[in-house]
Amino acid sequence: KTLVLGKEGESAELPCESSQKKITVFTWKFSDQRKILGQHGKGVLIRGGSPSQFDRFDSKKGAWEKGSFPLIINKLKMEDSQTYICELENRKEEVELWVFKVTANSDTHLLQGQSLTLTLESPPGSSPSVQCRSPRGKNIQGGKTLSVSQLELQDSGTWTCTVLQNQKKVEFKIDIVVLAFQKASSIVYKKEGEQVEFSFPLAFTVEKLTGSGELWWQAERASSSKSWITFDLKNKEVSVKRVTQDPKLQMGKKLPLHLTLPQALPQYAGSGNLTLALEAKTGKLHQEVNLVVMRATQLQKNLTCEVWGPTSPKLMLSLKLENKEAKVSKREKAVWVLNPEAGMWQCLLSDSGQVLLESNIKVLPTWSTPVQP
């Protein structure tokens, strides 16, 4: 018995070959002897039942001259899994068709961190093995259900599942979209008084995007977090619902989600968490955003440089006179120089030599007041 594997919804070709390699009379039947189709000597395809009943069944007329009389079954259904009989030249050939189906649990659009379950449906009597490969090349294998917990952004794309049965294989491709922000976390470094822009690009595109979101902010100087803004998203249009009066935030109405602060101030330095709840999805998307603010000041004989906000302990804060070696350099959030000499001083926040933030302050001779450019 010949075995043919098929995929639900697609087409399968069941072979039937003549030894004489020329056109001959043939009939395809179900195992219960009901006729499907055939050719009775006039080169015309005759169907066995009503057109509606047999419209999915066909043959390749072009192959008949070569002695090939395949049965083509279109739009395969799971119930097409059975034995088909080809009668020709006083012999019967049995062809077994097994139709398989691989589906993703409930939805192919899943939130980052959620689980993906791939389920194989197979005909009774079959014992296939299945292996799926993620877009980032990770292989998972198992029985009729395969699960991946904690989906990551890199899991977005085409998953390829190979079903193996009796050394024959059939391949399924399933497009999975992991709903997430492009970055889990971002950090913005600003001098005091500068404008601040926060961007929250999504890592996916869908035709219609609807949901609601909120930005909670934990200022370093504050004892508790505060909701800065709430908004709705309807068909990719952002509409602000409620916004705090301090700071005076503005939010763009188009994607990607984008917020602006008129100026960076020490009291705003801290961490925010933007959450986005999408319509018909359980759970929320999250992106963390951090704001570090620098201020350089001179009070009487003391030149001070301070940073506020979430800085890593390995960051270095330095004060140096332009074109000279750093006068002071510490892994701390404030540095100062007593009785600084006149000139342009630079306050630098750096990470392994890379400058993240810089603020200049001009120190005038002792009889005058400092100027901040």
Epitope: E197, K234, N235, E237, Q250, K253, P262
Partner: antibody, heavy 119, light 107 residues
Framework: EVELLESGGGLVQPGGSLRLSCAAS????????MSWVRQAPGKGLEWVSG????????YYADSVKGRFTITSDNSKNTLYLQMNSLRAEDTAVYYC????????????WGKGTTVTVSS | AIQMTQSPSSLSASVGDRVTITCRAS??????LGWYQQKPGKAPKVLIS???SLQSGVPSRFSGSRSGTDFTLTISSLQPEDFATYYC?????????FGQGTKLEIK
């Protein structure tokens, strides 16, 4: 070709009301955001009000908030601006404008209709 | 609301001159700014969208750029038909706001 035609302008006394209409042809109305923009005699352009394609979200300039109402009727492909408690400073040419598919810009404008508020 | 400060308010120039008009936004507005041309008695016409995207049918002598919250419209070589009033418009967020306008006149 997309065309916008405003109507409903005229002379009205302070405190009175007027409803402007903007009939659109050559487009699927519900797809695009729309706006009303005005220009007082000898002055610059002032954005007045906007509405999302779905009609669910409406927006207003502070100068007209609480007095003007923007609506749309997708079945009639028409945008409206209901103006109540009119003031002398509302005297202007009122233009309706269609926004691009992704709200990129106002790509189609009507010729405008004149509103005069005077006693 | 976001304020748009446009300068200069008027400008005299000659055919062939290079002209720049600037708009400053009171907040960061990404690239969500357009430039519009208006001639007396006519409706405005969009020249540039999203800071630098030239609209179809608009001559290439018009260009737009951005530096932070400063936006610039440049006309590389003025033509007689360019004498008009120019407006910037921020469409970053509602309420939208126009600049005060720049009237470009023949010197």
């Amino acid at each position: 070709e997309v065309e916008l035609l405003e109507s409903g302008g005229g002379l009205v006394q302070p405190g009175g009301s007027l409803r402007l209409s903007c009939a659109a042809s050559g487009l699927t109305f519900s797809t695009f955001a729309m706006s009303w923009v005005r220009q007082a005699p000898g002055k610059g352009l002032e954005w007045v009000s906007g509405i999302s394609g779905s009609g669910e979200n409406t927006y207003y300039a502070d100068s007209v908030k609480g007095r003007f109402t923007i609506t749309s009727d997708n079945s009639k492909n028409t945008l409206y601006l209901q103006m109540n408690s009119l003031r002398a400073e509302d005297t202007a040419v009122y233009y309706c404008a269609k926004e691009g598919y992704n709200w990129n810009y106002m790509d189609v404008w009507g010729k405008g209709t004149t509103v005069t508020v005077s006693s | 609301a976001i304020q748009m400060t446009q300068s200069p308010s008027s400008l005299s120039a000659s055919v062939g001159d290079r002209v720049t008009i600037t708009c400053r936004a009171s907040h960061g507005i990404r690239n969500d700014l357009g430039w519009y041309q208006q001639k007396p008695g006519k409706a405005p016409k969009v020249l540039i969208s999203e800071t630098s995207s030239l609209q179809s049918g608009v001559p290439s002598r018009f260009s737009g750029s951005r530096s932070g919250t400063d936006f610039t419209l440049t006309i590389s070589s003025l033509q007689p038909e360019d004498f008009a009033t120019y407006y910037c418009l921020q469409d970053y967020t509602y309420p939208y706001t126009f600049g005060q306008g720049t009237k470009l006149e023949i010197k």
